[in-house]
Amino acid sequence: MLRGGRRGQLGWHSWAAGPGSLLAWLILASAGAAPCPDACCPHGSSGLRCTRDGALDSLHHLPGAENLTELYIENQQHLQHLELRDLRGLGELRNLTIVKSGLRFVAPDAFHFTPRLSRLNLSFNALESLSWKTVQGLSLQELVLSGNPLHCSCALRWLQRWEEEGLGGVPEQKLQCHGQGPLAHMPNASCGVPTLKVQVPNASVDVGDDVLLRCQVEGRGLEQAGWILTELEQSATVMKSGGLPSLGLTLANVTSDLNRKNVTCWAENDVGRAEVSVQVNVSFPASVQLHTAVEMHHWCIPFSVDGQPAPSLRWLFNGSVLNETSFIFTEFLEPAANETVRHGCLRLNQPTHVNNGNYTLLAANPFGQASASIMAAFMDNPFEFNPEDPIPVSFSPVDTNSTSGDPVEKKDETPFGVSVAVGLAVFACLFLSTLLLVLNKCGRRNKFGINRPAVLAPEDGLAMSLHFMTLGGSSLSPTEGKGSGLQGHIIENPQYFSDACVHHIKRRDIVLKWELGEGAFGKVFLAECHNLLPEQDKMLVAVKALKEASESARQDFQREAELLTMLQHQHIVRFFGVCTEGRPLLMVFEYMRHGDLNRFLRSHGPDAKLLAGGEDVAPGPLGLGQLLAVASQVAAGMVYLAGLHFVHRDLATRNCLVGQGLVVKIGDFGMSRDIYSTDYYRVGGRTMLPIRWMPPESILYRKFTTESDVWSFGVVLWEIFTYGKQPWYQLSNTEAIDCITQGRELERPRACPPEVYAIMRGCWQREPQQRHSIKDVHARLQALAQAPPVYLDVLG
């Protein structure tokens, strides 16, 4: 409530300190501002300041509350409680300051209606404690509590942890417990969250059974406990029983949908909340679905199989067991975490007419067998040419079967002499050889002249993945790219990723910590993610938030997520999944603590101002063995991409990341064109090309292939051995283009042994076909990394 005074006119102007640094905020908090005749006065476009002494005793009915983003309250001795109802209408609130007031109690659910709150300053009040629940679910960047008579107890263990982990600007405040010394020194041995044990039946469970689960809760000061069953839906009839410390749960008449669904027991005390999730496996027989063969780089016969336990598979071709080879093999997509069904492909590498036929997939588990069959025709039999048939003479490379539609000649029914038969036979041979020649010429990308749309990525890239979005080779004409017919959308075979199982992560499981950077697409945050991996209840992740919410951005996001789900390799940055609940859309990646490889190399090179070591990297410049290890890991990631026929198109150290223990992975968060803008050459409107990493054919004809990636890898090697220098750093972009197209090579870096420079040069052959394969490059680097050459950098 307002205590006296009238409501001020809402003539908004900006809040002086803005959402700036903690320091600015603290100064503002203590310095006050110009006096205001009303209890609360508008401030900035969406702020409110309440500084008249003793004018408020609650925050009910603040003027223009629903649009407020900043609320500054000072000198309100009567404002002693902050509760859920006080902030009910403040859904847009970002910054809340209540300082030098009488605040004694903040309800655990006080900020339930202010989910966007990112800065909370409650300094110089009368707070003795603050529940962990108060800040639960908020992404607070700053929390200021200095100047409060805090009472050290387990209830403040969460705050002590924030101080230990450097969260929310808490460490700088050096919080004290009233008469008890620093909060940091508070004993916490007995301050644990509850411990939970969930007993699951060890016998196998069948459809229709009843299952009893029991959750034992132990710990001090238990407050409440329960079950989270949101994933179960119609998987079983649920009956809860018992209470603390032993909760019972009966799942009656279970269905197979219960598989992979989490049943979670939770308990809370004043220290925090604990959750334990279990899954009940319900046995059911195998089932299988087959879909029509689709052509990608390889052909794919898509399938879905289900069953618990997971069925084993067997392919039959025309009724006989099909033995898999490196040309015909089963490939699974990464399974969804919460279902038993698995999707995959029978991959056929460049099949011919001999592979046409009936494909059967047999799935079996101990509870039953199932099979499905499909006819697949990959190519007409080239030897079934009938001299009596009309001879097609026009070729269309767009046609699916390499010859055009209508016959040019009518079938002649008159019997001819031997000479005509011989003539026809000769013609047939000529026709076949011409056909093969045409297919060979027109169909470099596709052996059998069956064309599919190329996959083109927008040049400014949504993120890491879109750099990978070229399947096989692609060439962009100089007019393509942004602003042309592409309009920045990905063009692709629509069936390609339609079955990818993208893992969805709950928003409540993601706790944003702080911002790591910003790109054209949006921001990247460091976050803590709960329930992501079974072996860790929480882990640090990098979260990419999509700024734009347009339908096309959403579709790009979806496609990108599907693609990333497919890319699973120890040297490709791991993609955990997406969060699509609400806005913004989020992508969750593994967090690589040392950041991008370029920055890492520069900070661990001979020129680094301060060569800081760490627990996993020794101080001083990286040694030859380490440089080789880095190079070998990037090569391993590229071997994987090449094997999938993905063309990266922007391989550079800035687009690789370094994690704990000098683990290097390919991947970035789409910020390179913003952070490393000088590495790109702007062509036309918005197209930015990494010309210093590109081979002549990519610069001249926009031709991007696995071979152009090999060239880029050679440049990456050069970057590694120069500790992150920019290629052709002494030249402008146009000069660099001239050098590359004229065939000049980067010089051997000082730290680079001749053996490694020979590898670089093998990557920089002018003719793409002459370049070493990435597989060979990787093998050579691996061999060198295992036994680094003795190399002395003898300075002249």
């Epitope: 336990p309 084993s312 067997r314 079996a364 067998q369």
Partner: antibody
């Protein structure tokens, strides 16, 4: 090469229990499924049930549920069949068999069989 | 339960003769499996997935069928083929065997 060695013949009294063993060599039972099949004198074959030794999950024909218990010990690469409350109906040769490696669980290798005679 | 009925229960054939035995299922099964058993021996896998011969099985044997009707054929009977043959389904639990067909040489 793959072999399944079964324990020797058993003569047991009605109402008693018996445990038969089947020791595998030439492969790891954890990688397959292990089955037990019954053949009464001059009769056909009857599948009793099987076990996935990797996790201990079992499956039985309903008529043998309660009569037969299948277990496995991966450290000794051995599967077991325990038969309880024996009657003359249980007099038979019991075979252990390996579920086809990696595909449809059909039985590709069989033990030599263990003869169980229930008689007072 | 799926009941498998084998016929004939007993048959004899002369060397060189073509032999066909059938296995009929009470409801549709995806595939049929066949085993051969000789006196005082364990059964041996003979045909799996309806038409695929187990290793070591002579090419004169073949299997065919679908749905509820399956058969095992010997194109030219030989003395060593005299044995008892069982069909088995692995489509749904309980995994039943057929009653058996005893094949003798004339």
């Amino acid at each position: 090469q793959v072999q399944l060695q079964q324990s020797g013949a058993e003569l047991v009294k009605p109402g008693a229990s018996v445990e038969l063993s089947c020791t595998a060599s030439g492969f790891n039972i954890k990688d397959t499924y292990m089955h037990w099949v019954k053949q009464r004198p001059e009769q056909g074959l009857e599948w009793i049930g099987g076990i996935d030794p990797a996790n201990g999950n079992t499956i039985y024909v309903p008529k043998f549920q309660g009569k037969a218990t299948i277990t496995a010990d991966t450290s000794s690469n051995t599967a077991y069949l325990q038969l309880s409350s024996l009657t003359s109906e249980d007099t038979a040769v019991y075979y252990c068999a390996r579920g086809g490696y990696d595909f449809d669980y059909a039985m590709d290798y069989w033990g030599q069989g263990t003869s169980v005679t229930v008689s007072s | 339960d799926i009941v498998l009925t084998q016929s004939p229960a007993l048959m004899s054939a002369s060397p060189g003769e073509k032999v066909t035995m059938t296995c009929s299922a009470s409801s549709s099964v995806s595939y049929m499996y066949w085993y051969q058993q000789k006196p005082r021996s364990s059964p041996k896998p003979w045909i799996y997935l309806t038409s695929n011969l187990a290793s070591g099985v002579p090419a004169r044997f073949s299997g065919s069928g679908s749905g509820t009707s399956y058969s095992l054929t010997i194109s030219s009977m030989e003395a060593e083929d005299a044995a008892t043959y069982y069909c088995q389904q692995w489509s749904s639990n309980p995994y039943t065997f057929g009653g058996r067909t005893r094949l003798e040489i004339k």
